[in-house]
């Protein structure tokens, strides 16, 4: 599942080498001056924006309880503002009522501490160019995580780190279609940490999805529900504070 | 079938703590999480907390943080509740209700306890 | 903390009427909300989830609607056993909110 692939490499030819919302390349790159607000800072986790990097955010602590990654999500009751300036996210607002995705974004979750599972809806399904993002904390004696790109009842990319496989930790992936799970692809490059901070970043690609966890690319999991347009929700669940749950085109 | 059987009802004095319990059957505990709400005549419903029996790991209203305390027993399938520092403010009736921890196949506040009437007073 | 308004707050209503209870939250909640019914001198028993979906062995009479941050219940051929109140929920967000609750009662 794993491969080499930088998001350059994927979207080349795209007219758009380095498209907004995204470190140069596909990884943990460090972002040139005035880039993509994922150059890490002094006491982040590489790849971690500064604070108010992120559209709307508000100063470190902004709400109680809030986990500690990505200091200051945004307050509660408020979706991402306008960009913070040159290289933040495009602006943001609610997809239109065609279910199309305008270059503006992102879309999603309102902001604050949200409640797992968690339902993000996406109007019209997945396109390729779709990025979405989730932030979040692992809780402490965590068991699993879980995204789940639903078309209906079929999973079609159900993405599932375990913390304790028989004591071991894994990613296994996998498509559930009429009740029957798929052959698993196993990943073990495991990123996450109990109690640490996360973000997951999710490509739609023509013939695969790519999964980056902090800003370095993880695996990749090839399409076998074919029709994108009608995989029209993610379910967020396991053992997590979730922060944020968005998405956008890039 | 699912059930969620609670405590009997509870007369304590204000300052005390009371300890309510929720006992699950029909249905795998760990598949679910447990919640609290609180419910006084005339004030509506009100979420306390969350307990996943499979870690322990809890989630609470800031409201009810440091007062409130959760707890779950895989062994018996039963969750509990202590309250501390109550207050008049704390009679009520006090529901179990469990929530989906797996997405995907509903259990979103689906099945309840008969609740728990608790009565402060002096 | 999400506002989940609700209305009516009670309506009297026939048996086979066909009835909505509406419910709109404070900010977009992206259909994490459920309704439930609670009988008098009852518990409460949820009634759909996800906005849409009807709960395992909740009669098809009972339908969920919305986007965004207005939803509505409709219950159609009402039917004796429906006299009851109903709330909304959403768990979009930390805390958990509910509606204030909508009595139907026979007329």
């Known amino acids: 599942m794993a491969d080499n692939f930088s998001l350059h490499d994927a979207l080349s030819g795209s007219g758009n080498p380095n498209p907004q919302g995204w470190p140069g390349a596909w990884g943990n790159q460090p972002a040139g001056a005035g880039g993509y607000p994922g150059a890490s800072y002094p006491g982040a986790y590489p790849g971690q924006a500064p604070p108010g990097a992120y559209p709307g955010q508000a100063p470190p602590g902004a709400y109680p309880g809030a986990p500690g990654a990505y200091p200051g999500a945004p307050a509660p009751g408020v979706y991402p503002g306008p960009p913070s300036g040159p290289g933040a996210y495009p602006s943001s607002g609610q997809p239109s009522a065609t279910g199309a995705y305008p270059a503006t974004g992102p879309y999603g979750a309102p902001a604050g501490p949200l409640i797992v599972p968690y339902n993000l809806p996406l109007p019209g399904g997945v396109v390729p160019r779709m990025l979405i993002t989730i932030l979040g904390t692992v809780k402490p004696n965590a068991n699993r995580i879980a995204l789940d790109f639903q078309r209906g009842n079929d999973v079609a990319f159900h993405f599932n780190p375990r913390f304790n496989e028989n004591n071991r930790r894994v990613i296994v992936c996998n498509t559930k279609l009429d009740n029957n799970w798929g052959r698993e692809e196993r990943q073990s490059v495991f990123p996450f940490e109990s109690g640490k901070p996360f973000k997951i970043q999710v490509l739609v690609e023509p013939d695969h999805f790519k999964v980056a966890v902090n800003d370095a690319h993880l695996l990749q999991y090839n399409h076998r529900v074919k029709k994108l347009n009608e995989i029209s929700k993610l379910g967020i669940s396991g053992d997590i504070d979730l922060t944020s749950a968005s998405y956008t085109m890039i | 079938q699912v059930q969620l059987k609670q405590s009997g009802a509870e007369l304590v004095r204000p300052g005390a703590s009371v300890k309510l319990s929720c006992k699950a059957s029909g249905y795998t505990f760990t598949d679910y999480y447990i919640n609290w709400v609180k419910q006084r005549p005339g004030q509506g419903l009100e979420w306390i907390a969350r307990i996943y029996p499979g870690t322990g790991n809890t989630d609470y209203n800031e409201k009810f943080k440091g007062r409130a305390t959760l707890t779950a027993e895989k062994s018996s399938s039963t969750a509990y509740m202590q309250l501390s520092s109550l207050t008049s403010e704390d009679s009520a009736v006090y529901f179990c209700a469990r929530f989906a921890y797996y997405y995907g196949s509903g259990g979103y506040f689906d099945y309840w306890g008969h609740g728990t009437t608790l009565t402060v007073s002096s | 903390d999400i506002l989940m308004t609700q209305s009516p707050s009670s309506m009297s209503v026939s048996l086979g009427d066909t009835v909505s209870i509406t419910c709109h939250a404070s900010q977009g909640i992206n259909s994490n909300m459920g309704w439930l019914q609670q009988k008098p001198g009852k518990s409460f028993k949820g009634l759909i989830y996800h906005a849409t979906n009807l709960e395992d062995g909740v009669p098809s009479r009972f339908s969920g609607s919305g986007s965004g941050a207005d939803y509505s219940l409709t219950i159609s051929s009402l039917e004796s056993e429906d006299f009851a109140d109903y709330y909304c929920?959403?768990?979009?967000?930390?805390?958990?909110?509910f509606g204030s609750g909508t009595k139907l009662e026979i007329k």
């Open positions: 929920v959403q768990y979009a967000q930390f805390p958990p909110t």
